[in-house]
């Protein structure tokens, strides 16, 4: 998901303990709520409700270390994956513990960064080079967007990406530079 | 639009404290994190330190551990930055600027405080 | 600490003159560089970030390179408003360091 983006061909991904993709086990028990910090008011009806803050997805944790070229943060930094189909808040958690999908018959949910973090990290190098200081885009929470047919593919694409993705433009989240500049800050080493 | 608004200039005397503040608006506070540069008259610039309002981590140039405490108001969006045992080498500019990651730090910065320390 | 060598200190070109400033520092191989332009009673003003990459709004006639770990920031026809002294900024090692200043005036 958004990792792929700091061009960390070497990043590795280590899922905490107990934070696999498959469901947490506590997911098959009927009265827990989906951990997704956005999972709002369970709905009226679990199929009549149109308001998207009704709806949930899945947080996972990951762990992983940063790498650029052959230098490695000291200490892996842990991040939020936005992962898996939205549906109503009430059904979500039941309808993984049992591994079937609510699928929605109209519009389509999909489960997005919501909020995001900075995070500095040392990146140790070979050679007894002083540690490279960088700060890196972490994704914070998810949330369920809803996305209609007109909604096309290009935008799909962009929301596994914009998670790590560097930021510098004028508005607060922008969803991209051009491909010059995102080029140049990945070859530019930090 | 992204806007640092710094509060206004300060006369203080050797050995007292200041505590200036920088008001955040235009863009989610806790995304990015907040440095500090200091400008003395008719020289170059130095950064001090920068926090992570996210997590209130900050870190600090060693010439400035000890002196200047960095804090943040997450509700209100507000970066502090207090000097202690001030003395004249303390009398100068200082400015709050956000950092955007790696891509351009100090794309934004504040109007500048003055500092003037005088007996 | 990175300390950043800028030069000259200062430096007086004419108006359409192409000017080029340097910043040289004293160590680290993946120096992450930025160009920041100041106005008198003003605030620095992002120029150039990751060596050359400018900046959105800043006029094309400035550029920036980098030669291992030699920086340079070049006006390819100096205006009027151009008049201000500039800082190099290495954000890779921390402390963060500026260079020391190149003050530009116009003939």
């Known amino acids: 998901q958004g990792w792929q983006a700091f061009k960390n061909d070497a990043t590795e991904i280590i899922p905490e303990l107990g934070e696999y993709p498959e469901p947490p086990p506590e997911l098959e028990n009927n009265k827990t709520m989906n951990r997704a910090e956005n999972g709002g008011r369970p709905p009226h009806h679990p199929f009549e409700t149109k308001d998207v803050s009704e709806y949930s997805c899945r947080e996972l944790h990951f762990t992983r270390y940063v790498t650029d070229g052959p230098c490695r943060s000291a200490k892996p930094v842990t991040e939020l994956v936005c992962s898996g189909q939205c549906g109503p808040a009430r059904l979500l958690p039941n309808a993984i513990g049992r591994g079937k999908w609510w699928r929605p018959s109209g519009p389509d949910f999909r489960c997005i960064p919501d909020r995001y973090r900075a995070q500095r990290v040392q990146l140790l190098c070979p050679g007894g080079e002083a540690p490279r200081a960088r700060k890196v885009r972490l994704v914070a929470s998810c949330k369920c967007k809803r996305l209609t047919r007109f909604h096309n593919q290009s935008e799909l694409k962009d929301f596994g990406t914009e998670a790590a993705r560097p930021q510098k433009g004028r508005k607060p989240r922008p969803r991209a530079r051009s491909a010059k500049a995102n080029q140049a800050e990945l070859e530019n080493a930090y | 639009e992204v806007q640092l608004q710094q509060s206004g200039p300060e006369l203080v005397t050797p050995g007292a404290s200041v505590k200036i503040s920088c008001k955040a608006s235009g863009y989610t506070f806790t995304d990015h994190y907040m440095s500090w540069v200091k400008q003395s008259h008719g020289k170059s610039l130095e950064w001090i330190g920068d926090?992570?309002?996210?997590?209130?981590?900050?870190t600090y140039n060693q010439k400035f551990k000890g002196t200047a405490t960095l804090t943040v108001d997450k509700s209100s969006s507000i970066a502090y930055m207090e000097i202690r045992g001030l003395t004249s080498e303390d009398s100068a500019v200082y400015y709050c600027?956000?950092?955007?990651?790696?891509?351009?730090?100090?794309?934004?910065w504040g109007q500048g405080t003055l500092v003037t320390v005088s007996a | 600490d990175v300390q950043m060598i800028q030069s000259p200190s200062s430096l007086s070109a004419s108006l359409g003159d192409i000017v080029t400033m340097t910043c040289q520092a004293s160590?680290?191989?993946?120096?992450?560089l930025n160009w920041f332009q100041q106005k008198p009673g003003k605030a620095p003003k992002l120029l150039i970030y990751?060596?050359?990459n400018l900046e959105d709004g800043v006029p094309s006639r400035f550029s920036g390179s980098r030669y291992g770990t030699d920086f340079t920031l070049t006006i390819s026809s100096l205006e009027d408003e151009d008049l201000a002294t500039y800082f190099c900024?290495?954000?890779?090692?921390?402390?963060?360091?500026f260079g020391g200043g190149t003050k530009l005036e116009i003939k």
């Open positions: 926090i992570n309002p996210y997590s209130g981590e900050t």
């Open positions: 600027a956000r950092d955007d990651y790696d891509a351009s730090p100090f794309a934004y």
């Open positions: 900024l290495q954000h890779s090692y921390l402390p963060y360091t």
């Open positions: 990751g060596s050359s």
């Open positions: 160590q680290g191989t993946s120096i992450n």
